[in-house]
């Protein structure tokens, strides 16, 4: 999933993966 939300039962925080594309491709040379 692109974003993780909520907390687990041990009160851990979730890391947000929202800063990165879910299925990234290589940059094209222009």
């Amino acid at each position: 999933s692109e974003t993780t939300t909520g907390t687990s039962s041990n009160s851990s925080q979730s890391t947000s993966n929202s800063g990165l594309a879910p299925n990234p491709t290589n940059a094209t040379t222009k």
């Epitope: 851990s12 979730s14 890391t15 993966n17 929202s18 800063g19 290589n26």
Partner: antibody, heavy 115, light 112 residues
Framework: EVKFEESGGGLVQPGGSIKLSCAAS????????MDWVRQTPEKGLEWVAE??????????YYAESVKGRFTISRDDSKSRVYLQMNNLRTEDTGIYYC??????WGQGTSVTVSS | DIVMTQTPLSLSVTIGQPASISCKSS???????????LNWLQQRPGQSPKRLIY???KLDPGIPDRFSGSGSETDFTLKISRVEAEDLGIYYC?????????FGGGTKLEIK
């Protein structure tokens, strides 16, 4: 409190190997996409490698400059991510940070490649 | 690779005054899902980087709302509405749309 702690850095000769480790706490590690980023005065911040989560089949991505030399891996049971660095070059010198998809960052561990 | 160009290289701001940093990417960062993966990071002296903003304008938890991000496609801006002493450090833009992820060269914010 979220904490990422890197270890394993040090001085290594060109052509040598070293393995970095990052221990995470206070975070749902199994869901986090984990990256290694290095920092040097010359090149600034430079992304090195990424490993994603179980849901994405632990897919890995690498910077071209380290492909075939570095291997990123993770152990969700230990909340740890690793970076195995082989055939090291002087240009691999820098501070290596582990980060949860650029969200949380560790304090970094220094790697110096020199003869 | 996507080249991220930041301006200015450094700026000196009086406490309470605004500050603005520009970041330009060599290609559009708009992803196929309609989202734009442009992040802003802060690195205080002697510390590791810390993300402030993701997806152009979304503030990370605990980040003061004096920070804001805007822009689209290739042109992005980080604004601090009222600079505080704790804001000194280096600010980086970073793109997460295309591999390899790339960072700007950084903008050093100094306090007058």
């Amino acid at each position: 409190e979220v904490k990422f702690e890197e270890s394993g850095g040090g001085l290594v000769q060109p052509g040598g190997s070293i393995k970095l480790s990052c221990a995470a706490s206070g975070v749902t590690f199994s869901e986090a996409w984990m990256d290694w980023v290095r920092q040097t005065p010359e090149k600034g911040l430079e992304w090195v490698a990424e490993i994603r989560d179980r849901e994405t089949k632990y897919v890995t991505y690498y910077a071209e400059s380290v492909k075939g030399r570095f291997t990123i891996s993770r152990d969700d049971s230990k909340s740890r991510v690793y970076l195995q660095m082989n055939n090291l070059r002087t240009e691999d010198t820098g501070i290596y940070y582990c980060t949860g998809a650029m969200d949380y960052w560790g304090q970094g561990t220094s790697v110096t490649v020199s003869s | 690779d996507i080249v991220m160009t930041q301006t200015p290289l450094s700026l000196s701001v009086t406490i309470g005054q605004p500050a603005s940093i520009s970041c330009k990417s060599s290609q559009s960062l708009l992803y196929s899902n309609g989202k734009t993966y442009l992040n802003w990071l802060q690195q205080r002296p002697g510390q590791s980087p810390k993300r402030l903003i993701y997806q152009v304008s979304k503030l990370d938890p605990g980040i003061p709302d004096r920070f804001s991000g805007s822009g689209s496609e290739t042109d992005f801006t980080l604004k601090i509405s009222r600079v505080e002493a704790e804001d000194l450090g280096i600010y980086y833009c970073m793109q997460g749309t295309y591999l390899p992820w790339t960072f700007g060269g950084g903008t050093k914010l100094e306090i007058k």
